[in-house]
Interface confidence: low
């Protein structure tokens, strides 16, 4: 199921608003963490500080761990470095759409989306295009709401991410995440 159409309202972990709020917090934290590891001061990333609850902190730690693993995947880094940032909107949505084009949803692909967004943001920082940062975050959250929200609701909310990556084989899953993103970037390069 995709995220199209009307979604139930309310404050529970599977409500549209709660999933989007948590997603925004996770994405913001993930991007800030990646930028911090580059050692760069990024006032553009000084977005609204929102206190995270214990569950969101666990999720953030999980994402950080996966991000570290993906950072060490040289093939993936090489492909991301080759991304043409002259048309970031088109690149983002082609890659994002391709990641989910077969209709199969899993947490690995959701994380891959976050990771790709973070890399585009870091490129924007490096190339001194700070106004792109919020925009890229927005594209990611727009995509999340409009394509992935229904599926995340079906998983019981973001906590499903912890059980997916909470297994002893999470490194294997991370390799799969890198594969998904590499494949999408390859297709984009061919189409582009």
């Amino acid at each position: 199921m995709d995220g199209s159409g009307e979604q139930p309202r309310g404050g529970g972990p599977t409500s549209s608003e709660q999933i989007m709020k948590t997603g925004a917090l996770l994405l913001q934290g993930f991007i800030q963490d990646r930028a911090g590891r580059m050692g760069g001061e990024a006032p553009e990333l000084a977005l609204d500080p929102v206190p995270q609850d214990a569950s969101t902190k666990k999720l953030s730690e999980c994402l950080k761990r996966i991000g570290d693993e993906l950072d060490s995947n040289m093939e993936l880094q090489r492909m991301i470095a080759a991304v043409d940032t002259d048309s970031p909107r088109e690149v983002f949505f082609r890659v994002a759409a391709d990641m989910f084009s077969d209709g199969n949803f899993n947490w690995g692909r959701v994380v891959a989306l976050f990771y790709f967004a973070s890399k585009l943001v870091l490129k924007a920082l490096c190339t001194k295009v700070p106004e792109l940062i919020r925009t890229i975050m927005g594209w990611t959250l727009d995509f999340l709401r409009e394509r992935l929200l229904g599926w995340i609701q079906d998983q019981g909310g973001w906590d499903g991410l912890l059980s997916y990556f909470g297994t002893p084989t999470w490194q294997t899953v991370t390799i799969f995440v890198a594969g998904v993103l590499t494949a999408s970037l390859t297709i984009w390069k061919k189409m582009g």
Epitope: D2, G3, D48, R134, T135, G138, W139, L141, D142, R147
Partner: antibody
């Protein structure tokens, strides 16, 4: 150069139908959220509907839900607004617009097309 | 739905004046607010996005700021071509519909 050109407006009786078109050029509609915004005579701006072609997502204002349908033909780079069961209060200039993403606002607007619902 | 309460609804000012228009969001919208200028018979034009970023080609006398859920559009020195109606708009990412303020008409004193 980015351009949005609306067409299809006109005079229609209450209960009637109209289909508005928005021909986009200078960008790929497949990767943009397209919106219809209307403005009744002498009034403010009211968001009507949006479509994101890359993930087949549509959304509507409560005032038009069930009566209006937004769609897009990416091969023609054109967005549409099918308006059924029209009411007098739907009388307005209808603008087609491109939304630039979170916080980015609407960066390009068409010139607008007038829809008049009257008997 | 998130409401955007814009004030004043109209104001009279002279060329060279500093003009301030305010919008208050009914709940947090982070910085996802844009400002537009509209002249009679014309489509709106984007001035400010993400609360405080000046859109390409817009004169630097226009600026936007945010304090919590209050958003301000400032014209530092009003020019003859600035007499128009101004609208704020929110596009917070987990809130459809997009909503506009009621508009502020800036008239010549």
């Amino acid at each position: 150069e980015v351009q949005l050109v609306e067409s299809g407006g006109g005079l229609v009786q209450p209960g009637g139908s109209l289909r508005l078109s928005c021909a986009a050029s200078g960008f790929n509609l497949s990767y943009s959220s397209m919106h219809w915004v209307r403005q009744a005579p002498g009034k403010g701006l009211e968001w009507v509907a949006s479509i994101s072609s890359y993930y087949s997502y549509t959304s509507y204002a409560d005032s038009v839900k069930g009566r209006f349908t937004i769609s897009a033909d990416t091969s023609k780079n054109t967005a549409y607004l099918q308006m059924n069961s029209l009411r007098a209060e739907d009388t307005a200039v209808y603008y087609c617009a491109r939304y630039y993403g979170y916080g980015g606002g609407i960066d390009y607007w068409g010139q607008g097309t007038l829809v008049t619902v009257s008997s | 739905d998130i409401q955007m309460t814009q004030s004043p609804s109209s104001l009279s000012a002279s060329v060279g004046d500093r003009v301030t228009i305010t919008c208050r969001a009914s709940q947090s919208v982070s910085s996802a607010v844009a400002w537009y200028q509209q002249k009679p018979g014309k489509a709106p034009k984007l001035l400010i996005y993400s609360a405080s970023s000046l859109y390409s080609g817009v004169p630097s006398r226009f600026s936007g700021s945010r304090s919590g859920t209050d958003f301000t559009l400032t014209i530092s020195s009003l020019q003859p071509e600035d007499f128009a109606t101004y609208y704020c708009q929110q596009s917070w990412y987990y809130s459809y519909p997009i909503t506009f303020g009621q508009g502020t008409k800036v008239e010549i004193k």
